[in-house]
């Protein structure tokens, strides 16, 4: 399964979204940085068969509504803003899901890489543990926006790879 | 408000199989894996598996791999559990329980299915 | 998999008293991935303790984890009737996710 054109679209719209998410100078927030530890490795692409790939980035995307949908979120953001972002990570959703439906039909592949799950699990585990240990505070949140910000340009590149893996 | 329905109670014969269902409600189904978990009477608790409803792949503990089955159906938001060739060991209440991370993880649990082999 | 032991199996205490139930890992937990679940017969557990020290909402102040590595613990400050249950740990550090065995507290 190749993802379709517009799931890159739907990816840079996503970013776009993101940027004007941003209500505080990032400056003003620079006590409060922290390093979440971006599981990079899972990232790249190279050890993965597709069809794990396409799990592991259905999964990142998966946390990150989650994420962006609770109620301190809601409090949070612009609910335009927000809405539009729902909006692209279900449209991203739906295609990896399509792809995953279509690779189950592969034999002799692993469909997931439970480790790779359960590490980028853990990722968004480190986030949302410093989103209750901040309380939520606007700060916390810009922090976390950042992140997830650069997580969706540096899955970007595998997502695009992935676009055109034979 | 997030709930997980199950029935109360299964009796069924050795050698026999068994479908438990999970009806989820008060949020979107198919945006967090859902967690089986298996206790014996007056023991602890073991994990089986988790699947996520979005796209129904699964992870199993290796010891309930051929014992256990998950599924889900997304019309019904409700998520299954086959269980198959009953013996007494696996006479045990069976909860659902609701992924999610920080203080989500295994929040919502469902009120659990006993499972009584029995000829 | 990463064995969870839970000591001790049973255990009595007065209303007032501080108890402590420990948990044991086989292996090393991160302490972000280890829990506590409260329950009580005929009911399905209950969040009590995530990620080793932060209480679930609504749990009672009394209440306190602590621990890394392998080495675990619930703490009541002052024990209630109403704390009368069984504990259990759980990791999620790595697959299998694992359960310890229980401690049945009990009031005096």
């Known amino acids: 399964c190749d993802l379709p054109q517009t799931h890159s679209l739907s990816n840079r719209r996503t970013l776009m979204i993101m940027a004007q998410m941003g209500r505080i100078s990032p400056f003003s927030c620079l006590k409060d940085r922290h390093d979440f530890g971006f599981p990079q490795e899972e990232f790249d692409g190279n050890q993965f068969q597709k069809a794990q790939a396409i799990s592991v980035l259905h999964e990142m995307i998966q946390q990150t509504f989650n994420l962006f949908s609770t109620k301190d979120s809601s409090a949070t953001w612009d609910e335009t803003l927000l809405d539009k972002f729902y909006t692209e990570l279900y449209q991203q959703l739906n295609d990896l899901e399509a792809c995953m439906m279509q690779e189950v039909g592969v034999e002799d592949t692993p469909l997931m890489n439970v480790d790779s799950i359960l590490t980028v699990r853990k990722y968004f585990q480190r986030i949302t543990l410093y989103l209750t240990e901040k309380k939520y505070s606007p700060c916390a949140w810009e922090v976390v926006r950042a992140e997830i910000m650069r997580s969706f340009s540096l899955s970007a590149n595998l997502q695009e790879r992935l676009r055109r893996k034979e | 408000q997030v709930q997980l329905q199950q029935p109360g109670a299964e009796l069924v014969k050795p050698g026999a199989s068994v479908k438990l269902s999970c009806k989820a409600s008060g949020y979107t189904f198919t945006n967090y894996w859902m967690h089986w978990v298996k206790q014996r009477p007056g023991q602890g608790l073991e994990w089986i598996g988790e699947i996520n409803p979005s796209h129904g792949r699964t992870i199993y503990n290796e010891n309930f791999k051929s014992k256990a089955t998950l599924t889900v159906d997304k019309s019904s938001i409700t998520a299954f559990m086959q269980l198959s060739s009953l013996t007494s060991e696996d006479s045990a209440v069976y909860f659902c329980?609701?992924?999610?991370?920080?203080?989500?993880?295994?929040?919502?649990w469902g009120q659990g299915t006993l499972v009584t082999v029995s000829a | 998999q990463i064995v969870l032991t839970q000591s001790p199996a049973i255990m009595s205490a007065s209303p007032g008293e501080k108890v402590t139930l420990t948990c044991s890992a086989g292996?090393?937990?991160?302490?972000?991935?280890l829990y506590w679940y409260q329950q009580k017969p005929g009911s399905s557990p209950k969040l009590w303790i995530y990620s080793t020290s932060n209480l679930a909402s609504g749990v009672p102040a009394r209440f306190s984890g602590s621990g890394s590595g392998t080495s675990y613990s619930l703490t009541i400050s002052s024990m209630e009737a109403e704390d009368a249950a069984s504990y259990f740990c759980h990791q999620w550090s790595s697959y299998p996710f694992t359960f310890g065995s229980g401690t049945k507290l009990e009031i005096k």
């Open positions: 329980a609701r992924g999610g991370l920080g203080p989500a993880w295994f929040a919502y």
């Open positions: 292996s090393s937990v991160d302490s972000s991935y």
